[in-house]
């Protein structure tokens, strides 16, 4: 058993049918010595008396808010949560496996630049009685500071019969140098509590590996005289690290017809302009990627050919 | 993804082309190592990230773009100084800091070259003959060092009398390649920045 926060405790259980569970001793936070009784949640049934209460925690029915009283007055509370270990592996019931970029990916994180700021998100089908708390650091043995905000519900989607909820959090490394070569990964830890179930999820990454630039901005077309060709031009996104000559991007320019089946013409360039043939009803899209370290491509920025 | 091959103008900063070749070569070598050594811990998540140049050179600090010198987090240590005569210093405007930066890059390349050559000698003794260093990568390191053209004492190749532990050598190769790729990215950024300056 360990303390998650004041008066909230997590009991770790080896979870299998007929498991013996864990013996837990609760102590009433009071100078009083006698006349103390214990109850669980809203029930008025007295579970025991005395300054301490010994219970065998086996199932969720044994978890909850234990309260010690004296003469009708509440002295203190202890909330017991359960953390299930199923055959040596901690349960992952609360969050959905996003399966990207690989199986057992519960937390996904992205950064728009090298400033040390990043966003993580996760999915669940649970809509109520759900709380998250997020901590982060650079490295784990001698951790350096990363400050995270509160997790917020950022999107709701309908998936088949189920509703899916997306939560996200923004974090900022306290003293980040955009040019630094990372040798210790960022660690992100999310505590999730659903009703009386506790779970924790972690992700470990280098900022360089989660970079995804914003799409190029100011995408414009300039028709070339007496030609079907157009000059496409764009600019680096505002959110990208500066100076751009140091943090350079490379670009992919795509001409896509109305039909998805039509052949896509693609050109790669390090410049912020390109000359392409603009077909009728086609659209021109441009996306960006770090020129020197191949992390994710940005989303496409698009303009119609007409 | 293959990086686009740059064909520099004669007036272009002479080292940019070489640094792009270097990044391409080390990235290819790392990819090959990850595939060949699939049963060894060779991915970024599995290895310890060690920097053999730590406390010996200060490339990131010495080569920091001017725009980032206002960022206190980027100014940890800028004390290291090096010999300052190199052929990449194409214009007279080149500052002392630029010379320091390029000489730090040269020292990095020299250190990695020695490590890679020592390692290759060990890998050639492996009866499995599983993996060797790409000669192209070693040649590209050499070309960039020649382009930088700093005078510096030659570092003797380390020779080891004990029987090599091939498992450890292959893991060390992965660690070295990951670190060198990261440094090659920094070198490429620096060359691109200097070329634009």
């Amino acid at each position: 058993i360990w303390e998650l926060k004041k008066d909230v405790y997590v009991v770790e259980l080896d979870w299998y049918p007929d498991a013996p569970g864990e013996m837990v001793v609760l102590t009433c936070d009071t100078p009083e010595e006698d006349g103390i009784t214990w109850t669980l949640d809203q029930s008025s049934e007295v579970l025991g008396s005395g300054k301490t209460l010994t219970i065998q925690v086996k199932e969720f029915g044994d978890a909850g808010q234990y309260t010690c009283h004296k003469g009708g007055e509440v002295l203190s509370h202890s909330l017991l949560l359960l953390h299930k270990k199923e055959d040596g592996i901690w349960s992952t019931d609360i969050l959905k496996d996003q399966k990207e970029p690989k199986n057992k990916t519960f937390l996904r994180c992205e950064a728009k630049n090298y400033s040390g700021r990043f966003t993580c998100w996760w999915l669940t089908t649970i809509s109520t009685d759900l709380t998250f708390s997020v901590k982060s650091s650079r490295g784990s043995s001698d951790p350096q500071g990363v400050t995270c905000g509160a997790a917020t519900l950022s999107a709701e989607r309908v998936r088949g019969d189920n509703k899916e909820y997306e939560y996200s959090v923004e974090c900022q490394e306290d003293s980040a140098c955009p040019a630094a070569e990372e040798s210790l990964p960022i660690e992100v830890m999310v505590d999730a509590v659903h009703k009386l179930k506790y779970e924790n999820y972690t992700s470990s990454f280098f900022i360089r590996d989660i970079i995804k630039p914003d799409p190029p901005k100011n995408l414009q077309l300039k028709p070339l005289k007496n030609s079907r060709q157009v000059e496409v031009s764009w600019e680096y996104p505002d959110t990208w690290s500066t100076p751009h000559s140091y943090f350079s991007l490379t670009f992919c320019v795509q001409v896509q017809g109305k039909s998805k089946r039509e052949k896509k013409d693609r050109v790669f360039t390090d410049k912020t302009s390109a000359t392409v043939i603009c077909r009728k009803n086609a659209s021109i899209s441009v996306r960006a990627q770090d020129r020197y370290y191949s992390s994710s491509w940005s989303e496409w920025a698009s303009v119609p050919c007409s | 993804r293959n990086l686009p091959v740059a064909t520099p103008d004669p007036g272009m900063f002479p080292c940019l082309h070489h640094s792009q070749n270097l990044l391409r070569a080390v990235s290819n070598m790392l990819q090959k190592a990850r595939q060949t050594l699939e049963f060894y811990p060779c991915t970024s998540e599995e290895i310890d990230h060690e920097d053999i140049t730590k406390d010996k050179t200060s490339t990131v600090e010495a080569c920091l773009p001017l725009e980032l010198t206002k960022n206190e987090s980027c100014l940890n240590s800028r004390e290291t100084s090096f010999i300052t005569n190199g052929s990449c210093l194409a214009s007279r405007k080149t500052s002392f800091m630029m010379a320091l930066c390029l000489s730090s890059i040269y020292e990095d390349l020299k250190m990695y070259q020695v490590e890679f050559k020592t390692m290759n000698a060990k890998l050639l003794m492996d009866p499995k003959r599983q993996i060797f260093l790409d000669q192209n990568m070693l040649a590209v390191i050499d070309e960039l060092m020649q382009a930088l053209n700093f005078n510096s004492e030659t570092v003797p190749q380390k020779s080891s009398l004990e029987e090599p532990d091939f498992y450890k050598t292959k893991i060390k190769l992965c660690i070295l390649l990951h670190a060198f790729r990261i440094r090659a990215v920094t070198i490429d950024r620096v060359m691109s920045y200097l070329n634009a300056s």
């Epitope: 299998y16 592996i89 | 811990p41």
Partner: antibody, heavy 115, light 112 residues
């Protein structure tokens, strides 16, 4: 004490269907994940499928994906394996088992796919 | 498609020590715990070892398990005639959990 009693096995022709049941008692069935495991005659153990405690997630071996469906009825304390498009290579003893560091197995039920 | 490899058979005389190996990889045994099962002819498998080296109550102490790196082993110290059975190791793969990964199985024969 924990008990898993299996039923539903038998002889079936290729291409036909069969449903296996596993009735649980002696524990809170709705709190635990469940597996199906099979063993072809003279061969080793092969995992078939898993279902979460609440039925929210199901996982299958590639060899049965799209043909077999694992399900559970927590109100009846029963686990099921619906098998469709049966093949000769599905001939085996099928076991249900609880998920956890200590597990309990059903007695097994024989499924023979033969024309 | 078994990823955990066991020797097809091992044998010993009563009182001898026999060991069965179970060889896997970094993503299965290297990252997860190992179980061992005993299966007597015509019966369901019975758990002998869980969490690499833990014995459930009721399992004789002549059975012991261990794990090192990407392989595990089961030792029967002072093998007895009633130990003649098939033995299977089991683990998970970190990418496909909760799918059970079984070993190829080992037939233990007690001679004499």
């Amino acid at each position: 004490q924990v008990q898993l009693v299996q039923s539903g096995g038998g002889v079936v022709q290729p291409g036909r269907s069969l449903r296996l049941s596993c009735a649980a008692s002696g524990f809170t069935f709705s709190s635990y994940g469940m597996h199906w495991v099979r063993q072809a005659p003279g061969k080793g153990l092969e995992w078939v499928a898993f279902i979460r405690y609440d039925g929210s997630n199901k996982y299958y071996a590639d060899s049965v994906k799209g043909r077999f469906t694992i399900s559970r009825d927590n109100s009846k304390n029963t686990l099921y394996l619906q098998m469709k498009s049966l093949r000769a290579e599905d001939t085996a003893v099928y076991y249900c088992k609880t998920h956890g560091s200590h597990d309990n197995w059903g007695q097994g039920t024989m499924v023979t796919v033969s024309s | 498609s078994y990823v955990l490899t066991q020797p097809p058979s091992v044998s010993g005389t009563p009182g001898q020590r026999v060991t069965i190996s179970c060889s896997g990889g970094r993503s299965n045994i290297g990252s997860n715990t190992v179980k061992w099962y005993q299966q007597l002819p015509g019966t369901a498998p019975k758990l002998l070892i869980y969490s690499n080296d833990q014995r459930p109550s009721g399992v004789p102490d002549r059975f012991s398990g261990s794990k090192s790196g990407t392989s595990a082993s089961l030792a029967i110290t002072g093998v007895q005639a009633e130990d003649e059975a098939d033995y299977y190791c089991q683990s998970y793969d970190r990418g496909t959990h909760p799918a059970l990964l079984f070993g190829t199985g080992t037939k233990v024969t007690v001679l004499g």
